[in-house]
């Protein structure tokens, strides 16, 4: 049975270039090890934005230099992407893999379109 992954269709980044969204998956089994990957799709090219593996019940930890942070609660992951600029506007796909125990399951969301608007520079003041 396929694993369903749900994520919002659209998110608007804050003026500070921060975007948050929830990625929720319907687990077909009792996974203890889950890997979550955020992918960016642009012009049919897919690249990895960030990824984290976590044990169920433990916190989600991205690498120190990652632009992502997140928290997990059951089958729900709250993802935050930082440092976004207008050129980063695009489709961000949440990918979930149930790594352990067997069987392995793959779940791919439909993607969240993140819109990023660069803030207007402050006018010079005399």
């Amino acid at each position: 049975k396929a694993m369903h992954v749900a994520q919002p269709a659209v998110v608007l980044a804050s003026s500070r270039g921060i975007a948050s969204f929830v990625c929720e998956y319907a687990s077909p089994g009792k996974a203890t090890e889950v890997r979550v990957t955020v992918l960016r799709q642009a012009d049919s090219q897919v690249t990895e934005v960030c990824a984290a593996t976590y044990m169920m019940g433990n916190e989600l930890t991205f690498l120190d230099d990652s632009i992502c942070t997140g928290t997990s609660s059951g089958n729900q992951v709250n993802l935050t992407i930082q440092g976004l600029r207008a050129m980063d506007t695009g489709l961000y796909i949440c990918k979930v893999e149930l790594m352990y125990p067997p069987p392995y399951y793959l779940g791919i969301g439909n993607g969240t379109q993140i819109y990023v608007i660069d803030p207007e520079p402050c006018p010079d003041s005399d």
Partner: antibody
């Protein structure tokens, strides 16, 4: 460009062992899950085994479980398949394949032929 | 284990004709997790379609995929001489990863 090059195939007697290698280049090997897939002469494709990007998770087809071991050395950009207790039915071309970001096997090596015969 | 059954086993067609290949799964496969591969004699398989209908990089638009649930189709709108090969469907949504037995598209 992405390249996968298998080596280590050959003729081996039943019950003996063989180790296959797959040298990867043109991409960040340590970020990708990898597979071995085989194809018996004149037959279809059969998935053999999977290893996660970091080597911590491995899965095997029932037909090879307990006899084959998949491993990887990310510092050498190389994938391995240790095949023990080989049988005639293991005779096949063995391909290594990369898992693309969205799941399909997006790049394949050219394959290496393993013949198990007395 | 998800069993994939392809039909027909062999398809005999002429260049320029339309080819329709079928892949049926023993249980539901999400459309995000169905791929098609092409294999020519002496060569490794090549990814054509993933996610049931997305073309892989460099694949011409005469190749298209469709379907959902348990029934999937690969269509080649106008066969070119280089399209005569064996085609495999595959599911990659859960282990064990499985392939169909293949459909050979041969010149009539």
């Amino acid at each position: 460009q992405v390249q996968l090059v298998e080596s280590g195939g050959g003729v081996v007697q039943p019950g003996r062992s063989l180790r296959l290698s797959c040298a990867a280049s043109g991409f960040t090997f340590s970020s990708y899950h990898m597979h071995w897939v085989r194809q018996a002469p004149g037959k279809g494709l059969e998935w053999v085994t999977f290893i996660s990007y970091d080597g911590n998770n491995k899965y095997y087809a029932d037909s090879v479980k307990g006899r084959f071991t998949i491993s990887r050395d990310n510092s050498k950009n190389t994938l391995y398949l240790q095949m023990n207790s080989l049988r005639a039915e293991d005779t096949a071309i063995y391909y290594c394949a990369r898992t693309g970001w969205l799941g399909p096997f997006d790049y394949w090596g050219q394959g290496t032929l393993v013949t198990v015969s007395s | 284990e998800i069993v994939l059954t392809q039909s027909p086993g062999t398809l005999s067609l002429s260049p320029g004709e339309r080819a329709t290949l079928s892949c049926r799964a023993s249980q539901s496969v999400g459309s995000s997790y169905l791929a098609w591969y092409q294999q020519k004699p002496g060569q490794a398989p090549r990814l054509l379609i993933y996610g049931a209908f997305s073309r892989a990089t460099g694949i011409p638009d005469r190749f298209s995929g469709s379907g959902s649930g348990t029934d999937f189709t690969l269509t080649i709108s106008r066969l070119e001489p280089e399209d005569f090969a064996v085609y495999y469907c595959q599911q990659y949504g859960s282990s064990p990863w499985t392939f169909g037995q293949g459909t050979k598209v041969e010149i009539k």
